[in-house]
């Protein structure tokens, strides 16, 4: 067989699909690999072979187009199940071709199993909702092509086990289901179950994705640094750990990337030729809104570093905001005197990186070390 | 501890309503739903309703369609099971019964009320 | 709806021994079914989900099996406190239905 260009595993398209439930899958390479479409291919006169290896095989086999009620079949760059079976699961290839010309790639296609509830192993799209932001509404995805425009089918929507009806915010409308307004309580699993007819059989779509309420834009507010604040000072004696934490609350923003760091006399620690090290921790509220917490830590610190301007810096999509540490040099107590209040700069360190763990309360913390020297 | 506890045992004319209640501890910060299961003397359990006190979700079982209405009090977490139109054979022991979350269909009758017995009878 | 019918009504067994209780399911209720056990005047407890998960803290001895339409609850060895009824529930479809239990009861 002549040389054909091979595009190999395409896993970015890991295809999961129910079973005993339609399914029509495009041939991928028109989609991501080719500069040209079916049509163009076929008035060319070029041919789309379709062929397979099941699960735990090495074999490659020719697709049985001719089993009872057509269960598989191909129209144009589509390839249709109707229904899968869960032996169907495999890799895939389609092959464009010609006595000159050949292109092929090939997918996986998994046939999953759901429960009464929906639970499955397929990976579920996220669909975000404002909180309290007026009616927002989803749509049950992916139907598109299953049957024609004169077909009326029906449509289901359940969250978890339970079919939506007389629910107080939540409102079916065919293929959308509307939030009249949306709460915390509305996060979680919705299914849509799409049935309709086809040659005196019924076939039902079942859809899953997952709503996740999140703080409104109306809500919004460009950085707020908690931390440093004018309330604490950094007093430090020479030889001693200077730890300073630098800790940014962020409204949630859609596709906001939100940047926390620290400046020192005005430039990147990593350009200061000082040993920082800079721990980074991260945790979301219930509707998303984030805190960085990023400490700046000097292990022994020299009466030159305590003269130095050390600035936090905080960046989102609402704007920019900075706010400079107080660190001061400690003066040593006279040696008659009983240890005032000047002694209290290492448990204000203390006590700050405290306050951090519990503002974050049960967070989940991503720890980055970097060491700049 | 999740706990559920129902109010007292009644006794009702034929023809009348009864409110049963069931007052939840330790509620789950995700939805749940509330069952309502009916046993009357050495007969099995029969399904009656849902509600999802949260989101205000119910359903029926076709039988009760009418005669029951499910209602729940979020402040209070407390769910309500009214049947009206009483008649002698809804002589029964009354339970509620909730699961962890609207996920999990196998264990939806996961923790159970002391059970509520309101005798009809003229 | 989905009619769960179980036999026998009423299973004499004498402690250590075992007890086998049986539940079909009128149509497939895949493995979307449950075991449930009733002492007088208690509410019932639940025992076994998913045909065959052990509820937490149930004992061993206790085990589900089946699938489709035919299921089994098997007490491997019957303890004094495991005489009772037992109640069988599919949640396949809706509305959720039981059966009408059985009885076991000491030989």
């Known amino acids: 067989s002549e040389r054909c260009d091979d595009w190999g595993l395409d896993t970015m398209r890991q295809i999961q699909v129910f079973e005993d439930e339609p399914a029509r899958i495009k041939c991928p390479l028109f989609e991501h690999f080719l500069k040209f479409n079916y049509s163009t291919a076929h008035s060319a006169g070029l041919t789309l072979i379709w062929y397979w290896t099941r699960q735990d095989r090495d074999l490659e086999e020719p697709i049985n187009f001719r089993l009872p009620e057509n269960r598989i079949s191909k129209e144009k760059d589509v390839l249709w199940f109707r229904p899968t079976l869960l032996n169907d699961t495999g890799n895939y290839t389609c092959m464009l071709r010609n006595t000159t010309y050949c292109s092929k790639v090939a997918f996986p296609l998994e046939v999953v199993q759901k429960d009464s509830c929906f639970n499955s192993p397929m990976k579920l799209p996220v669909h975000k909702l404002y909180i309290e932001y007026g009616i927002q509404r989803i749509t049950c995805p992916n139907v598109d092509g299953y049957f024609p425009s004169s077909v009326k089918p029906t449509i289901t929507w359940y969250m978890g086990c339970y079919k939506i009806q007389n629910f107080n915010n939540v409102i079916p409308e065919g293929m959308n289901l509307s939030f009249l307004i949306a709460f915390i309580s509305n996060n979680g699993n919705y299914t849509c179950v799409v049935t309709y007819p086809e040659n005196g059989r019924t076939f039902h779509l079942t859809r899953t994705l997952t709503v996740k309420v999140v703080g409104s834009p109306k809500n919004a507010v460009p950085p707020v640094i908690h931390s440093p604040n004018d309330h604490v000072v950094y007093e430090k004696e020479p030889g001693e750990e200077l730890l300073i934490p630098c800790t940014v609350y962020f409204s949630f923003l859609m596709d906001s990337r939100n940047e926390v760091w620290w400046t020192i006399d005005g430039k990147k620690p990593d350009d200061i030729p000082i040993d920082v090290t800079i721990n980074e921790s991260i945790s979301h509220s219930r509707t998303e809104d984030e805190t960085r917490t990023q400490i700046l830590s000097i292990k022994k610190v020299t009466s030159e570093d305590l003269k130095r301007s050390y600035v936090c810096h905080a960046r989102s999509a609402k704007g920019e905001v900075a706010k400079a540490a107080t660190v001061k040099q400690k003066v040593p107590a006279p040696r008659y005197t009983v240890e005032g209040g000047g002694g209290t700069g290492g448990l204000n360190d203390i006590f700050e990186a405290q306050k951090i763990e519990w503002h974050e309360g049960g967070g989940h913390h991503h720890h980055h070390h970097h060491h700049h020297h | 501890q999740v706990q559920l506890v129902q109010s007292g045992a009644e006794v009702k004319k034929p023809g009348s309503s009864v409110k049963v209640s069931c007052k939840a501890s330790?509620?789950?910060?995700?939805?749940?739903?509330i069952q309502w299961v009916r046993q009357a003397p050495g007969q099995g359990l029969e399904w009656m309703g849902y509600?999802?006190?949260?989101?205000?979700?119910?359903d029926y079982a076709q039988k009760f369609q009418g005669r029951v209405t499910i209602t729940a009090d979020e402040s209070t977490s407390t769910a309500y099971m009214e049947l009206s139109s009483l008649r002698s054979e809804d002589t029964a022991v009354y339970y509620c019964?909730?699961?962890?979350?609207?996920?999990?269909?196998?264990?939806?009758?996961?923790?159970w009320g002391q059970g509520t017995l309101v005798t009809v009878s003229s | 709806e989905i009619v769960m019918t179980q036999s026998p009504a009423t299973l004499s067994v004498s402690p250590g021994e075992r007890a086998t209780l049986s539940c079909r399911a009128s149509?497939?209720?895949?493995?979307?079914l449950a075991w449930y056990q009733q002492k007088p005047g208690q509410a019932p407890r639940l025992l076994i989900y998913?045909?065959?998960t052990r509820a937490t803290g149930i004992p061993a001895r206790f085990s589900g099996s089946g699938s489709g339409t035919e299921f089994t609850l098997t007490i491997s060895s019957l303890q004094s406190e495991d005489f009772a009824v037992y109640y069988c529930?599919?949640?396949?479809?809706?509305?959720?239905?039981f059966g009408q239990g059985t009885k076991v009861e000491i030989k």
């Open positions: 019964a909730r699961g962890q979350t609207l996920y999990d269909a196998g264990r939806q009758f996961d923790i």
């Open positions: 330790g509620s789950p910060a995700e939805p749940y739903a």
């Open positions: 509600i999802i006190p949260s989101l205000g979700g119910y």
């Open positions: 149509q497939s209720v895949s493995s979307n």
């Open positions: 998913g045909a065959s």
């Open positions: 529930q599919q949640y396949n479809n809706w509305p959720w239905t």
